[in-house]
Amino acid sequence: SGTTNTVAAYNLTWKSTNFKTILEWEPKPVNQVYTVQISTKSGDWKSKCFYTTDTECDLTDEIVKDVKQTYLARVFSYPAGNVESTGSAGEPLYENSPEFTPYLETNLGQPTIQSFEQVGTKVNVTVEDERTLVRRNNTFLSLRDVFGKDLIYTLYYWKSSSSGKKTAKTNTNEFLIDVDKGENYCFSVQAVIPSRTVNRKSTDSPVECMGQEKGEFRE
Protein backbone atom coordinates (compact mmCIF):
# COMPACT_ATOMS: atom_id res chain seq x y z
CA SER A 1 0.00 0.00 0.00
CA GLY A 2 1.01 3.68 -0.11
CA THR A 3 0.60 6.74 -2.25
CA THR A 4 1.32 6.61 -5.95
CA ASN A 5 4.32 8.90 -5.65
CA THR A 6 6.22 7.39 -2.73
CA VAL A 7 8.09 4.12 -2.37
CA ALA A 8 8.93 2.35 0.83
CA ALA A 9 12.51 2.31 2.03
CA TYR A 10 14.30 -1.02 1.73
CA ASN A 11 17.64 -2.65 2.62
CA LEU A 12 17.60 -1.03 6.05
CA THR A 13 21.06 -1.71 7.47
CA TRP A 14 22.77 -0.87 10.74
CA LYS A 15 26.35 0.38 10.39
CA SER A 16 27.97 0.56 13.80
CA THR A 17 31.58 0.74 15.00
CA ASN A 18 32.52 1.28 18.65
CA PHE A 19 28.88 2.30 19.18
CA LYS A 20 28.88 5.07 16.56
CA THR A 21 25.70 3.88 14.88
CA ILE A 22 24.10 4.87 11.61
CA LEU A 23 21.04 3.41 9.95
CA GLU A 24 21.30 3.27 6.16
CA TRP A 25 18.65 2.44 3.59
CA GLU A 26 17.65 2.67 -0.06
CA PRO A 27 16.52 4.08 -2.44
CA LYS A 28 17.93 7.51 -3.08
CA PRO A 29 14.82 9.66 -2.89
CA VAL A 30 13.04 10.93 -5.98
CA ASN A 31 10.28 13.36 -5.05
CA GLN A 32 10.13 11.98 -1.54
CA VAL A 33 11.66 12.49 1.90
CA TYR A 34 12.23 10.28 4.91
CA THR A 35 11.81 10.40 8.68
CA VAL A 36 13.30 7.79 10.98
CA GLN A 37 11.91 6.51 14.26
CA ILE A 38 13.73 4.40 16.82
CA SER A 39 12.50 2.49 19.84
CA THR A 40 13.51 -0.17 22.29
CA LYS A 41 11.29 -3.23 22.38
CA SER A 42 9.32 -1.86 25.29
CA GLY A 43 9.77 1.88 24.70
CA ASP A 44 8.09 4.67 22.77
CA TRP A 45 9.03 5.68 19.26
CA LYS A 46 11.34 8.67 18.94
CA SER A 47 11.59 10.54 15.65
CA LYS A 48 14.97 11.47 14.17
CA CYS A 49 16.28 12.91 10.89
CA PHE A 50 13.02 14.65 10.03
CA TYR A 51 11.98 14.88 6.38
CA THR A 52 15.47 14.21 5.13
CA THR A 53 16.63 13.49 1.61
CA ASP A 54 19.57 11.53 3.04
CA THR A 55 19.52 7.75 3.05
CA GLU A 56 21.20 7.49 6.40
CA CYS A 57 20.47 8.64 9.92
CA ASP A 58 22.88 8.83 12.85
CA LEU A 59 21.17 7.13 15.78
CA THR A 60 24.19 7.08 18.08
CA ASP A 61 22.65 9.48 20.60
CA GLU A 62 19.73 7.13 21.08
CA ILE A 63 21.48 3.78 21.29
CA VAL A 64 24.19 4.95 23.70
CA LYS A 65 21.52 5.55 26.33
CA ASP A 66 21.58 1.79 26.95
CA VAL A 67 23.85 -0.24 24.71
CA LYS A 68 22.52 -3.55 26.07
CA GLN A 69 18.96 -2.84 24.93
CA THR A 70 17.63 -4.15 21.63
CA TYR A 71 16.52 -1.43 19.22
CA LEU A 72 14.20 -1.32 16.26
CA ALA A 73 14.04 1.53 13.77
CA ARG A 74 11.61 2.34 11.00
CA VAL A 75 11.90 4.64 8.03
CA PHE A 76 8.82 6.59 6.86
CA SER A 77 8.46 7.79 3.28
CA TYR A 78 6.59 11.02 2.47
CA PRO A 79 5.98 12.82 -0.81
CA ALA A 80 8.33 15.78 -1.12
CA GLY A 81 6.45 19.00 -0.42
CA ASN A 82 3.45 17.13 0.99
CA VAL A 83 4.61 15.46 4.17
CA GLU A 84 1.06 15.28 5.51
CA SER A 85 0.14 12.80 2.80
CA THR A 86 -0.46 9.25 3.96
CA GLY A 87 -0.71 5.81 2.47
CA SER A 88 -3.97 4.15 1.52
CA ALA A 89 -4.36 2.76 5.02
CA GLY A 90 -4.30 6.29 6.40
CA GLU A 91 -0.71 6.29 7.58
CA PRO A 92 2.64 7.00 5.92
CA LEU A 93 4.47 4.23 4.16
CA TYR A 94 7.25 2.79 6.33
CA GLU A 95 9.68 -0.10 6.57
CA ASN A 96 11.13 -1.72 9.71
CA SER A 97 14.82 -2.31 10.30
CA PRO A 98 16.28 -5.53 11.64
CA GLU A 99 16.64 -5.54 15.41
CA PHE A 100 19.96 -4.22 16.69
CA THR A 101 21.65 -4.79 20.05
CA PRO A 102 24.69 -2.51 20.20
CA TYR A 103 26.57 -4.39 22.92
CA LEU A 104 26.38 -7.61 20.94
CA GLU A 105 26.66 -6.25 17.42
CA THR A 106 28.64 -3.03 17.14
CA ASN A 107 31.82 -3.64 15.17
CA LEU A 108 35.08 -3.36 17.03
CA GLY A 109 37.09 -0.53 15.53
CA GLN A 110 40.69 -1.00 14.47
CA PRO A 111 42.78 -0.76 17.64
CA THR A 112 45.91 1.34 18.00
CA ILE A 113 49.10 0.53 19.82
CA GLN A 114 49.61 3.47 22.13
CA SER A 115 53.15 2.69 23.27
CA PHE A 116 55.71 0.04 24.02
CA GLU A 117 58.48 0.15 26.54
CA GLN A 118 61.38 -2.24 26.82
CA VAL A 119 63.06 -2.94 30.13
CA GLY A 120 65.80 -5.51 29.69
CA THR A 121 64.25 -8.64 28.20
CA LYS A 122 60.64 -7.57 28.77
CA VAL A 123 58.45 -5.30 26.68
CA ASN A 124 55.27 -3.68 27.91
CA VAL A 125 52.89 -3.04 25.01
CA THR A 126 49.92 -0.75 25.69
CA VAL A 127 46.78 -0.63 23.54
CA GLU A 128 45.01 2.71 23.30
CA ASP A 129 41.72 2.56 25.20
CA GLU A 130 39.52 4.21 22.64
CA ARG A 131 36.85 6.59 23.81
CA THR A 132 33.29 5.76 22.80
CA LEU A 133 30.20 7.96 22.68
CA VAL A 134 28.63 5.98 25.52
CA ARG A 135 28.24 8.20 28.57
CA ARG A 136 28.02 7.59 32.28
CA ASN A 137 27.76 10.45 34.79
CA ASN A 138 28.39 12.94 32.01
CA THR A 139 31.71 11.42 30.96
CA PHE A 140 32.43 9.40 27.85
CA LEU A 141 33.31 5.77 28.52
CA SER A 142 36.22 3.96 26.92
CA LEU A 143 35.81 0.66 25.09
CA ARG A 144 37.24 -1.12 28.14
CA ASP A 145 34.79 0.71 30.42
CA VAL A 146 31.88 -0.55 28.34
CA PHE A 147 32.98 -4.13 27.69
CA GLY A 148 35.09 -4.82 30.79
CA LYS A 149 36.59 -8.32 30.75
CA ASP A 150 34.35 -9.28 27.81
CA LEU A 151 36.94 -7.55 25.61
CA ILE A 152 40.33 -9.10 25.02
CA TYR A 153 43.24 -8.10 22.86
CA THR A 154 45.39 -10.50 20.90
CA LEU A 155 48.96 -9.36 20.30
CA TYR A 156 51.05 -10.60 17.40
CA TYR A 157 54.76 -9.91 17.67
CA TRP A 158 57.82 -10.95 15.74
CA LYS A 159 61.48 -10.16 15.35
CA SER A 160 62.03 -7.53 12.67
CA SER A 161 64.60 -9.89 11.20
CA SER A 162 62.28 -12.90 10.99
CA SER A 163 58.78 -13.88 9.89
CA GLY A 164 57.96 -16.28 12.73
CA LYS A 165 55.21 -14.76 14.84
CA LYS A 166 54.31 -15.21 18.48
CA THR A 167 51.10 -14.25 20.22
CA ALA A 168 49.78 -13.24 23.61
CA LYS A 169 46.40 -12.16 24.90
CA THR A 170 45.17 -9.88 27.63
CA ASN A 171 41.86 -8.85 29.15
CA THR A 172 43.39 -5.52 30.13
CA ASN A 173 45.00 -3.11 27.66
CA GLU A 174 48.56 -4.13 28.46
CA PHE A 175 50.85 -6.98 27.47
CA LEU A 176 54.10 -7.89 29.15
CA ILE A 177 56.13 -10.13 26.87
CA ASP A 178 59.57 -11.68 26.90
CA VAL A 179 61.95 -10.68 24.14
CA ASP A 180 65.53 -11.43 23.18
CA LYS A 181 67.95 -8.70 24.17
CA GLY A 182 69.37 -6.72 21.29
CA GLU A 183 66.56 -7.72 18.91
CA ASN A 184 64.01 -5.33 17.44
CA TYR A 185 60.39 -6.50 17.40
CA CYS A 186 57.25 -5.50 15.56
CA PHE A 187 53.76 -5.55 17.06
CA SER A 188 50.16 -5.67 15.92
CA VAL A 189 47.01 -6.10 18.00
CA GLN A 190 43.46 -7.23 17.40
CA ALA A 191 40.40 -6.72 19.59
CA VAL A 192 38.14 -9.72 20.22
CA ILE A 193 34.96 -10.34 22.17
CA PRO A 194 35.07 -14.12 22.77
CA SER A 195 31.45 -14.43 23.91
CA ARG A 196 30.04 -13.05 20.66
CA THR A 197 28.86 -15.04 17.69
CA VAL A 198 28.96 -12.14 15.19
CA ASN A 199 31.32 -9.19 14.73
CA ARG A 200 33.73 -10.88 17.10
CA LYS A 201 37.04 -9.50 15.90
CA SER A 202 38.44 -6.16 14.82
CA THR A 203 40.83 -5.68 11.98
CA ASP A 204 44.48 -5.71 13.00
CA SER A 205 46.05 -2.49 14.24
CA PRO A 206 48.74 -0.82 12.19
CA VAL A 207 52.09 -2.51 12.78
CA GLU A 208 54.45 -0.72 15.16
CA CYS A 209 58.11 -1.64 15.38
CA MET A 210 60.82 -1.03 17.92
CA GLY A 211 63.24 1.65 16.84
CA GLN A 212 60.32 3.88 15.89
CA GLU A 213 58.84 6.82 17.77
CA LYS A 214 56.32 5.06 20.00
CA GLY A 215 58.91 2.96 21.78
CA GLU A 216 61.04 3.56 24.79
CA PHE A 217 64.04 1.54 25.87
CA ARG A 218 65.51 1.18 29.33
CA GLU A 219 68.26 -1.18 30.45
Epitope: I152, T154, Y156, K165, K166, T167, A168, K169, T170, I177, Q190, V192, P194, S195, T197, V198, R200, K201, T203, D204
Partner: antibody, heavy 117, light 107 residues
Framework: EVQLVESGGGLVQPGGSLRLSCAAS????????MHWVRQAPGKGLEWVGW????????IYDPKFQDRFTISADTSKNTAYLQMNSLRAEDTAVYYC??????????WGQGTLVTVSS | DIQMTQSPSSLSASVGDRVTITCKAS??????LSWYQQKPGKAPKLLIY???SLADGVPSRFSGSGSGTDFTLTISSLQPEDFATYYC?????????FGQGTKVEIK
Protein backbone atom coordinates in the same frame (compact mmCIF):
# COMPACT_ATOMS: atom_id res chain seq x y z
CA GLU B 1 25.10 -26.99 14.29
CA VAL B 2 28.83 -26.33 14.63
CA GLN B 3 30.95 -29.13 13.20
CA LEU B 4 34.62 -29.65 12.38
CA VAL B 5 35.62 -32.58 10.18
CA GLU B 6 39.27 -33.44 9.61
CA SER B 7 40.40 -35.46 6.61
CA GLY B 8 43.59 -36.28 4.72
CA GLY B 9 45.23 -38.57 7.25
CA GLY B 10 46.71 -41.92 6.30
CA LEU B 11 49.93 -43.83 5.89
CA VAL B 12 52.94 -41.91 4.62
CA GLN B 13 56.61 -42.81 4.32
CA PRO B 14 59.29 -41.02 6.32
CA GLY B 15 60.34 -37.87 4.46
CA GLY B 16 56.96 -37.66 2.78
CA SER B 17 54.30 -34.94 2.88
CA LEU B 18 50.63 -34.81 3.73
CA ARG B 19 47.98 -32.11 3.77
CA LEU B 20 45.21 -32.35 6.34
CA SER B 21 41.92 -30.51 5.95
CA CYS B 22 39.51 -29.25 8.57
CA ALA B 23 36.12 -28.50 7.05
CA ALA B 24 33.95 -26.27 9.22
CA SER B 25 30.19 -25.93 9.13
CA UNK B 26 27.70 -24.02 11.23
CA UNK B 27 29.97 -20.98 11.55
CA UNK B 28 32.38 -18.85 9.58
CA UNK B 29 36.03 -19.69 10.24
CA UNK B 30 37.10 -16.09 9.61
CA UNK B 31 35.30 -15.09 12.81
CA UNK B 32 37.47 -17.38 14.96
CA UNK B 33 41.01 -18.65 15.37
CA MET B 34 41.61 -22.20 14.20
CA HIS B 35 44.16 -24.51 15.83
CA TRP B 36 45.79 -27.82 15.14
CA VAL B 37 46.57 -30.12 18.07
CA ARG B 38 48.05 -33.59 17.82
CA GLN B 39 48.15 -36.67 20.03
CA ALA B 40 50.63 -39.49 19.56
CA PRO B 41 49.29 -42.97 20.36
CA GLY B 42 48.92 -43.36 24.13
CA LYS B 43 50.39 -39.88 24.73
CA GLY B 44 49.12 -36.46 25.72
CA LEU B 45 47.92 -33.50 23.70
CA GLU B 46 50.45 -31.33 21.88
CA TRP B 47 49.69 -27.91 20.40
CA VAL B 48 50.88 -27.43 16.83
CA GLY B 49 49.77 -23.92 15.90
CA TRP B 50 46.96 -21.60 14.92
CA UNK B 51 45.70 -19.40 12.12
CA UNK B 52 43.49 -16.35 12.04
CA UNK B 53 41.72 -17.15 8.75
CA UNK B 54 40.59 -13.55 8.33
CA UNK B 55 44.08 -12.11 7.93
CA UNK B 56 46.26 -15.20 7.49
CA UNK B 57 48.28 -14.66 10.66
CA UNK B 58 49.82 -17.94 11.75
CA ILE B 59 51.53 -18.94 15.00
CA TYR B 60 53.42 -22.22 15.49
CA ASP B 61 55.09 -24.09 18.24
CA PRO B 62 58.74 -23.48 17.25
CA LYS B 63 59.35 -27.21 16.93
CA PHE B 64 56.96 -27.32 13.96
CA GLN B 65 57.77 -23.97 12.35
CA ASP B 66 60.09 -25.34 9.67
CA ARG B 67 58.11 -28.37 8.54
CA PHE B 68 54.44 -27.54 9.08
CA THR B 69 52.35 -24.82 7.45
CA ILE B 70 48.83 -23.84 8.48
CA SER B 71 46.59 -22.12 5.96
CA ALA B 72 42.91 -21.46 5.41
CA ASP B 73 40.50 -20.93 2.55
CA THR B 74 37.60 -18.83 3.81
CA SER B 75 35.62 -19.43 0.62
CA LYS B 76 35.68 -23.16 1.42
CA ASN B 77 35.41 -22.55 5.19
CA THR B 78 38.33 -24.90 5.63
CA ALA B 79 41.65 -24.81 7.47
CA TYR B 80 44.65 -26.87 6.39
CA LEU B 81 47.80 -28.33 7.88
CA GLN B 82 50.57 -29.01 5.38
CA MET B 83 53.17 -31.37 6.85
CA ASN B 84 56.52 -31.92 5.14
CA SER B 85 59.59 -34.04 5.90
CA LEU B 86 57.48 -36.32 8.04
CA ARG B 87 59.12 -38.52 10.66
CA ALA B 88 58.01 -41.59 12.59
CA GLU B 89 57.49 -39.39 15.67
CA ASP B 90 54.87 -37.37 13.77
CA THR B 91 52.58 -40.39 13.94
CA ALA B 92 49.52 -39.10 15.79
CA VAL B 93 45.86 -38.24 15.66
CA TYR B 94 45.61 -34.65 14.42
CA TYR B 95 42.72 -32.53 15.66
CA CYS B 96 41.55 -29.12 14.56
CA UNK B 97 39.81 -26.92 17.10
CA UNK B 98 37.90 -23.66 17.07
CA UNK B 99 39.18 -20.95 19.41
CA UNK B 100 36.92 -18.15 20.60
CA UNK B 101 40.03 -16.32 21.89
CA UNK B 102 39.10 -17.51 25.38
CA UNK B 103 38.96 -21.28 24.90
CA UNK B 104 38.76 -24.11 22.37
CA UNK B 105 35.03 -24.76 22.28
CA UNK B 106 34.70 -27.20 19.37
CA TRP B 107 37.03 -29.95 18.20
CA GLY B 108 36.97 -32.26 15.22
CA GLN B 109 36.96 -36.03 15.60
CA GLY B 110 40.61 -36.23 14.54
CA THR B 111 42.42 -37.85 11.64
CA LEU B 112 45.18 -40.43 12.09
CA VAL B 113 48.53 -39.87 10.43
CA THR B 114 50.91 -42.84 10.40
CA VAL B 115 54.50 -42.30 9.30
CA SER B 116 56.15 -45.62 8.54
CA SER B 117 58.12 -47.36 5.88
CA ASP C 1 58.40 -20.96 26.87
CA ILE C 2 55.98 -21.95 29.62
CA GLN C 3 56.07 -25.48 31.01
CA MET C 4 52.96 -26.96 32.59
CA THR C 5 53.46 -29.63 35.23
CA GLN C 6 50.30 -31.59 35.91
CA SER C 7 49.87 -33.96 38.82
CA PRO C 8 49.16 -36.68 39.54
CA SER C 9 49.68 -38.46 36.23
CA SER C 10 46.99 -40.94 37.26
CA LEU C 11 44.69 -41.59 40.18
CA SER C 12 42.18 -44.20 41.25
CA ALA C 13 38.93 -43.06 42.82
CA SER C 14 35.44 -44.27 43.55
CA VAL C 15 32.09 -42.84 42.53
CA GLY C 16 31.21 -40.05 44.93
CA ASP C 17 34.83 -39.20 45.76
CA ARG C 18 36.18 -35.67 45.66
CA VAL C 19 38.99 -35.50 43.12
CA THR C 20 41.62 -32.77 42.80
CA ILE C 21 44.06 -32.34 39.92
CA THR C 22 46.74 -29.66 39.94
CA CYS C 23 48.65 -27.83 37.26
CA LYS C 24 51.73 -25.70 37.91
CA ALA C 25 53.04 -23.18 35.38
CA SER C 26 56.74 -22.42 35.13
CA UNK C 27 55.91 -18.71 35.30
CA UNK C 28 52.94 -16.41 35.91
CA UNK C 29 50.18 -17.03 33.37
CA UNK C 30 47.57 -14.95 35.23
CA UNK C 31 44.23 -16.73 34.64
CA UNK C 32 44.92 -17.92 31.11
CA LEU C 33 44.35 -21.58 31.81
CA SER C 34 41.67 -23.99 30.65
CA TRP C 35 40.83 -27.58 31.51
CA TYR C 36 39.75 -30.31 29.07
CA GLN C 37 38.34 -33.80 29.53
CA GLN C 38 39.16 -36.54 27.03
CA LYS C 39 37.67 -40.02 26.78
CA PRO C 40 39.36 -42.82 24.79
CA GLY C 41 38.98 -42.39 21.04
CA LYS C 42 37.22 -39.04 21.45
CA ALA C 43 38.19 -35.40 21.04
CA PRO C 44 38.86 -33.30 24.13
CA LYS C 45 35.95 -31.41 25.66
CA LEU C 46 36.17 -28.01 27.34
CA LEU C 47 35.36 -27.94 31.06
CA ILE C 48 36.81 -24.73 32.51
CA TYR C 49 38.26 -21.56 30.99
CA UNK C 50 39.96 -18.49 32.46
CA UNK C 51 40.97 -20.81 35.32
CA UNK C 52 37.61 -20.59 37.11
CA SER C 53 34.78 -20.17 34.56
CA LEU C 54 32.58 -23.19 33.95
CA ALA C 55 31.93 -23.88 30.27
CA ASP C 56 28.35 -24.11 29.01
CA GLY C 57 26.71 -27.45 29.64
CA VAL C 58 29.36 -28.67 32.07
CA PRO C 59 28.00 -30.04 35.37
CA SER C 60 28.55 -27.86 38.43
CA ARG C 61 30.48 -30.63 40.20
CA PHE C 62 33.45 -29.44 38.13
CA SER C 63 35.23 -26.33 39.35
CA GLY C 64 38.51 -24.58 38.73
CA SER C 65 40.60 -22.39 40.98
CA GLY C 66 43.93 -20.61 41.03
CA SER C 67 45.81 -17.90 39.18
CA GLY C 68 49.43 -17.02 38.52
CA THR C 69 51.29 -20.33 38.62
CA ASP C 70 49.11 -22.75 40.61
CA PHE C 71 45.82 -24.12 39.36
CA THR C 72 43.39 -26.81 40.48
CA LEU C 73 40.56 -28.74 38.86
CA THR C 74 38.14 -30.24 41.39
CA ILE C 75 35.40 -32.78 40.83
CA SER C 76 33.28 -32.53 43.97
CA SER C 77 31.55 -35.90 43.61
CA LEU C 78 32.93 -38.21 40.97
CA GLN C 79 30.34 -39.73 38.62
CA PRO C 80 30.73 -42.84 36.42
CA GLU C 81 30.95 -40.68 33.29
CA ASP C 82 33.85 -38.67 34.75
CA PHE C 83 36.39 -41.48 34.36
CA ALA C 84 38.62 -39.97 31.69
CA THR C 85 41.90 -38.14 31.16
CA TYR C 86 42.08 -34.46 32.10
CA TYR C 87 44.43 -31.86 30.61
CA CYS C 88 45.24 -28.30 31.57
CA UNK C 89 46.21 -25.84 28.85
CA UNK C 90 48.14 -22.61 29.19
CA UNK C 91 46.50 -20.51 26.47
CA UNK C 92 47.57 -16.94 27.21
CA UNK C 93 50.65 -16.83 25.04
CA UNK C 94 52.35 -18.94 22.42
CA UNK C 95 53.41 -21.63 22.30
CA UNK C 96 50.26 -22.89 24.01
CA UNK C 97 51.21 -25.73 26.35
CA PHE C 98 49.22 -28.68 27.62
CA GLY C 99 49.91 -30.45 30.89
CA GLN C 100 50.90 -34.10 30.61
CA GLY C 101 47.41 -35.27 31.55
CA THR C 102 45.83 -36.98 34.54
CA LYS C 103 44.06 -40.28 34.02
CA VAL C 104 41.19 -40.78 36.46
CA GLU C 105 40.49 -44.50 36.84
CA ILE C 106 37.94 -46.52 38.77
CA LYS C 107 39.22 -47.87 42.08
Amino acid sequence: EVQLVESGGGLVQPGGSLRLSCAASGFNIKDYYMHWVRQAPGKGLEWVGWIDPENGNTIYDPKFQDRFTISADTSKNTAYLQMNSLRAEDTAVYYCARDTAAYFDYWGQGTLVTVSS
Amino acid sequence: DIQMTQSPSSLSASVGDRVTITCKASRDIKSYLSWYQQKPGKAPKLLIYYATSLADGVPSRFSGSGSGTDFTLTISSLQPEDFATYYCLSDGSSPFTFGQGTKVEIK
